[in-house]
């Protein structure tokens, strides 16, 4: 799987997850968040090359597709697969409010 | 929605579904399918600017992150949302065979 | 050059479960259906059934319906014949074998080495 | 099914003989112009190798001496010249009906 255990240990230059740090207030201008101050959220990149943790039926015929015709542009593209949440606290006034994200987390990737 | 009403009608330069055709003796070496010998599988390419389309919190984020630090090189990327199947037909022996095959049409693409 | 290497020898029991593998390399295992074919000790060649790699699209002989199942891993080239309900008779060699690639049934060009299954209790 | 009927079950012959096997279908395995009849050739210990596909087309890298005729039902595999390396179990297969049927095997052993 191309999960943060493998792509974390390896020098892979195929679709992977990579590591990419947020801060809340400085990357996306977000100050009302009180904790956590950043997470990683990471993300996908890499080229997908024929086969690579395909997707879909789709998937593997576009990669297919590629391999036979290498002057085509149309390839598939590395992105998440699982992800997970991220629980913030912030104030509504001066009441604390915990809240859970959806999604918030790359924890692996495919070629889609 | 970036869908084949949309995207075929318009020149979009970002994220959207794009005509393929796909022959599948000529383009995938698969002698063995009678009916049809090709189809439009579509693919999605385009860029994802900040909230096209986003797939999910993560995406906006990263979306987000983007847009406020350009020279990062993590952004979303433009990946089929809706697919359809395709039927086709093939020989065993003499006998006809008819198979559905699952996510095969790219009908409208996300930014994930 | 196009090479078919399976899994080693395997000793089972009545009643039990062997799932053999074959690894493709050397063409684009995508375009072409894989067959399995056994062969008792002494004994002809015996047709399983079919896979084709892309689509996961499966025919079994009808003799195995039921009791086998094919399989492929497209991220390693690796196709699998899992075969249950073992009886004594189901003691042979199994061949992979990749159909030539003009129809779903076809001639066979390329072959596995083999991969022998002894049923005894 | 069909039944592939292939004969002599076995024959001695000696290098730089001529060698013909039959094979027998037991319904046409002809269909859209082509005759649906293969022929492959196994030595002990090893994997069946293609020699013949389509009845009479020789697989790359088989020699001359190998050939294949027929139609219908009835098919034959020659070998021109026999070679000390030919020795070895020859079987026919058809791939008109589901499932994909072959023969019982020729066996050609050294005089």
């Known amino acids: 799987a191309l999960d943060t255990n493998y792509c974390f240990r390896n020098l892979e230059e195929n679709c992977c997850v990579r590591p990419l740090y947020i801060d809340f207030r400085q990357d996306l201008g977000w100050k009302w968040v009180h904790e956590p101050k950043g997470y990683y959220a990471n993300f996908c990149s890499g080229p997908c090359p024929y086969l690579r943790s395909a997707d879909t039926t789709h998937s593997t015929v576009l990669g297919l597709y590629n391999t036979l015709n290498p002057e085509a542009s149309a390839s598939p593209c590395c992105v998440p697969q699982d992800l997970e949440p991220l629980t913030i606290l912030y104030y509504v006034g001066r009441t604390p409010k915990v809240e859970q994200l959806s999604n918030m987390v790359v924890k692996s990737c495919k070629c889609s | 929605a970036l869908d084949t009403n949309y995207c075929f009608r318009n020149l979009e330069e970002n994220c959207c579904v794009r005509p393929l055709y796909i022959d599948f003796r000529q383009d995938l070496g698969w002698k063995w399918v009678h009916e049809p010998k090709g189809y439009y599988a579509n693919f999605c390419s385009g860029p994802c600017p900040y909230l096209r389309s986003a797939d999910t919190t993560h995406s906006t984020v990263l979306g987000l992150y983007n847009t406020l630090n350009p020279e990062a090189s993590a952004s979303p990327c433009c990946v089929p949302q809706d697919l359809e199947p395709l039927t086709i037909l093939y020989y065993v022996g003499r006998t006809p065979k008819v198979e559905q095959l699952s996510n095969m049409v790219v009908k409208s693409c996300k930014c994930s | 050059q196009v090479q078919l290497v399976q899994s080693g020898a395997e000793v089972k029991k009545p009643g039990a479960s062997v799932k053999v593998s074959c690894k493709a390399s050397?063409?684009?295992?995508?375009?072409?259906?894989m067959n399995w074919v056994r062969q008792a000790p002494g004994q002809g060649l015996e047709w399983m059934g079919q896979?084709?790699?892309?689509?996961?699209?499966?025919n079994y002989g009808e003799m195995f319906e039921g009791r086998v199942t094919m399989t492929t891993d497209t991220s390693t080239s690796t196709a699998y014949m899992e075969l249950r309900s073992l009886r004594s008779d189901d003691t042979a060699v199994y061949y992979c074998a990749r159909g030539i690639g003009n129809y779903a049934l076809d001639a066979m060009d390329y072959w596995g080495q083999g991969t022998l299954v002894t049923v005894s209790s | 099914d069909i039944q592939m009927t292939q004969s002599p079950s076995s024959l001695s012959a000696s290098v730089g003989d001529r060698v013909t096997i039959t094979c027998r279908a037991s319904?046409?395995?002809?269909?859209?112009?082509?005759?649906?009849m293969h022929w492959y050739q196994q030595k002990p210990g090893k994997a069946p190798k293609l020699l013949i596909y389509l009845a009479s087309n020789l697989e790359s890298g088989v020699p001359s001496r190998f050939s294949g005729s027929g139609s219908g039902t009835d098919f034959t595999l020659t070998i021109s010249s026999l070679q000390p390396e030919d020795f070895a179990t020859y079987y026919c297969q058809q791939n008109i009906e589901d499932p994909l049927t072959f023969g019982g095997g020729t066996k050609v052993e050294i005089k």
């Open positions: 050397g063409y684009t295992f995508t375009s072409y259906w």
């Open positions: 319904e046409s395995v002809d269909w859209w112009g082509n005759s649906f």
């Open positions: 896979i084709f790699p892309a689509l996961g699209s499966t």
